[in-house]
């Protein structure tokens, strides 16, 4: 931006200027050009010999300006177009300044001004221009300062030149209020800081509902002496519940919100939000839809899932396998997870209490993402109620549960471990195992053999322990080998059905299972 | 010295035509603006036409726009002025007159021009 | 166009006197003014152009001033050669137009 301090041209002939010598020299004319009337002071003493005359501006107002810039508009005639070469003729003349802190009027004296330079023509006018008026003009401009004092003077020597002076404009540079990246810089002089920097740092302040971003810079911008903002550094954002619009933070339109100062626009609310008022934030959940802590705000509102699908429980002796589907409504979200519990009743006394300590599953029971878990180590002859919890990330945030829950009957023991504890080639010793709350219950124990193959006869064998030796058996021969446990009320779950094989007559002490 | 030198005129019926000549000499004729200068018996002087120094642009006063017509021939160092359409008004002393920028010590040239150098007349009566 | 009136049209003086003839212009046409003498059957002769500009070869009791639309051709100390009639000429615009003369006369 450019303040004029002075226009000459813009006066239209209305200023007037000083000259020196009075009467004599520099003069005002008005011509026509472009058929508009225009003004100018011209000399043009070109056979009069040595020249020394001045024209001096009016007293000139500095204001806010430190360095002013002459920018001259004129035109110089050829000398070679005078009869002669007009032998005392010159193409140029001199620009000079003075400061001071009074208008002297017209008290004129030239060692008070201080020459700035010799102003030479880019083009001279030759005869042909002339006639033909075609006005050469030259445009030259000049940079003075620093100033000091209130005002100063402008002065022009001619020196025998025949010089028109079409336009005088003096201005100083202003670096424009500007408005970038939201935020609002003040109008500045322009003004070198020192000859090294030669660029003015100004802090901006953000536009109304925009803040500098957390931990960002605030907005800085470089005023040149050009009167150029350069160099934009940090910036503003619009805040919460607004949007950039063209240089503007604008509120976000009702059914839209924003949560955070940031570059993005405002969003529309999700799905299961209630429509928002202008310049909302967030978007509140519709009654029965919540959101989780870590959900983000542009996320819909979700609620708790229904309940598991088709939960079955296959009894396998003293083992149940629970098994189910997901919820038919999971509620908008994916991170449903699983929580088995389980409540064993004795059958007598109807008495029921949890069995968590009791039992084992597979997997921890309280985040499960499969939908299946098997328990092992039931006690038989017990009653067990198995409930599987579907939750999501909003379950916390209702008191309500969605669970569905299955029953099963345990009669039986578990079945034993069975392993080969030694064999030869006539014998096998084989050992089981049960768990120690089961043990109690069991009266004797049956061992089934027979040989692999055959299966029209088969071998039994009691005992109470927990071991037994099967002799008289072929060499190099597999036998299957099945543990059952025998209990009061009658057959126990029996073990699943094992491989065992005797040793060659040649073979050797090596046990192959 | 500069010497312009008018002929050409006389006595002519209204309507008729007539063509003056001015001859020049002891300056650069190609270098002036030449132009046609009237004076009517007893009266003032009435600009009437000027021709640029290559032959343009030419102007003309109202009163005789459309019936006059001024040309140079810069190799035979001649201006003419043709006239038809003679009217009574037209009888007057036709001057030559010439302008030379170099004698004219301005920075900027006027929007039109004065005459530094004149022939000495020729005379055109229109009578019947 | 432009209209130039001059004052006034005829005067008598004695040779030495001061003579000052007017010419007023019906608009401005800053200093764009020329003075011209012409004797009895001859051409006009260029004396004055730019308003105050003395062509070359007048002599320097000749002198004009002013500007816009009034200016004056003033002879300071009349001369015997210098009774003649003076015309003032405007050349601000194409039509380049002349007073109507003033005659300077011994008295």
């Known amino acids: 931006k450019e303040v004029v301090l002075l226009d000459f041209a813009a006066m239209k002939g209305e200023l007037g200027w000083l000259t020196h010598p009075y009467g004599k020299g520099w003069d005002l004319m008005q011509n026509i050009m472009d058929d508009m009337p225009i003004y100018m002071y011209s000399v043009c003493n070109v056979v009069s010999g040595d020249q020394d005359n001045w024209l001096r501006t009016n007293w000139v107002y500095r204001e806010e300006a430190e360095r002013i810039f002459i920018e001259l508009k004129f035109t110089v005639r050829d000398c070679n177009s005078f009869p002669g070469g007009a032998s005392s003729c010159k193409e140029t003349f001199n620009l000079y300044y003075a400061e001071s802190d009074v208008d002297y009027g017209t008290n004129f004296q030239k060692r008070q001004f201080t020459k700035i330079d010799t102003i030479a023509p880019d083009e001279i006018t030759v005869s042909s221009d002339f006639e033909a008026r075609n006005v050469k003009l030259n445009v030259e401009e000049r940079m003075v300062g620093p100033l000091t004092r209130k005002g100063f003077y402008l002065a022009f020597q001619d020196i025998g030149a025949c010089v028109a002076l079409l336009s005088v404009r003096v201005y100083y540079k202003k670096c424009p209020e500007m408005l970038q990246s939201l935020a609002r810089f003040p109008e500045t002089i322009a003004v070198a800081v020192s000859d090294t920097q030669p660029l003015a740092t100004v802090a901006g302040t953000c536009v109304d509902h925009a803040v500098v971003p957390y931990g960002g810079e605030g907005p800085l911008m470089h005023c040149t002496v050009d009167g150029e903002w350069l160099v934009p550094i940090g910036q503003c954002l619009c805040q919460e519940g607004y949007e950039k619009v063209e240089d503007a933070c604008r509120a976000c339109s009702p059914g839209f919100f924003k949560s955070e100062a940031s570059e993005s626009p405002c969003l529309e609310c999700p799905e299961h939000t209630l429509p928002s008022t202008e310049g909302a934030t967030s978007c509140q959940c519709e009654e029965g839809y919540f959101r989780a802590p870590e959900d983000p705000l542009s996320m819909s509102c979700t609620r708790p899932p229904s309940a598991p699908n088709y939960l079955t429980a296959i009894g396998m002796g003293a083992k149940v396998e629970l098994r189910w589907t997901a919820p038919k409504d999971t509620g908008g979200r994916q991170d449903i997870v699983y929580s088995v519990t389980c409540e064993q009743c004795w059958p007598e006394s109807g008495e029921c209490g949890p069995c968590e300590a009791s039992v084992r599953y597979s997997e921890p029971p309280h985040a499960l993402t499969r939908t299946s878990v098997t328990v092992s180590d039931l006690e038989p002859h017990m009653n067990y109620t198995f409930a599987v919890e579907a939750r999501n990330g909003v379950s916390g945030l209702v008191t309500s549960r969605s669970f569905r829950t299955a029953s099963v009957s345990i009669n039986q023991t578990e079945p034993p471990k069975v392993r080969l504890e030694d064999r030869s080639t006539t014998s096998l010793s084989v050992t089981w195992s049960i768990p120690v709350s089961q043990q109690s219950r069991v009266w004797k124990y049956e061992v089934t053999y027979r040989k692999k193959g055959d299966a029209n006869s088969y071998n039994v064998r009691r005992t109470e322990g927990f071991s037994v030796t099967l002799d008289d058996l072929a060499p190099d021969t597999t036998y299957l080998v099945q543990v059952q446990a025998l209990t009061q009320e009658g057959q126990g779950a029996g073990s699943k059905v094992h491989e065992f094989q005797t040793l060659s007559t040649e073979g050797s002490a090596n046990m192959a299972v | 010295e500069v010497q312009l030198l008018e002929s050409g005129g006389g006595l002519v019926q209204p309507g008729g035509s007539l063509r003056l000549s001015c001859a020049a000499s002891g300056f650069t004729f190609s270098h002036y603006m030449m132009a046609w200068v009237r004076q009517a018996p007893g009266k003032g002087l009435e600009w009437v036409s000027r021709i640029g120094p290559s032959g343009g642009p030419t102007h003309y006063a109202d009163s005789v726009k459309g019936r006059f017509t001024i040309s140079r021939d810069n190799s035979k160092n001649t201006l003419y002025l043709q006239m038809n359409s003679l009217r009574a008004e037209d009888t007057a002393v036709y001057y030559c007159?010439?302008?030379?920028?170099?004698?004219?010590?301005?920075?900027?040239?006027?929007?039109?021009?004065?005459?530094?150098?004149w022939g000495q007349g020729t005379l055109v009566t229109v009578s019947s | 166009d432009i209209q130039m009136t001059q004052s006034p049209s005829s005067l008598s003086a004695s040779v030495g006197d001061r003579v000052t003839i007017t010419c007023r212009a019906s608009?401005?046409?800053?200093?764009?003014l020329a003075w011209y003498q012409q004797k009895p059957g001859k051409a006009p002769k260029l004396l004055i152009y730019?308003?105050?500009n003395l062509h070359t070869g007048v002599p320097s009791r000749f002198s004009g001033s002013g500007s816009g639309t009034e200016f004056s051709l003033t002879i300071s100390g009349l001369q015997p050669d210098d009774f003649a009639t003076y015309y003032c000429?405007?050349?601000?615009?194409?039509?380049?137009?002349f007073g109507q003369g003033t005659k300077v006369e011994i008295k």
């Open positions: 608009q401005s046409i800053s200093t764009w």
């Open positions: 000429q405007q050349y601000n615009a194409y039509s380049r137009t």
């Open positions: 730019k308003a105050s």
């Open positions: 007159a010439g302008y030379d920028s170099g004698y004219d010590y301005v920075a900027v040239a006027g929007p039109a021009e004065y005459f530094q150098h």
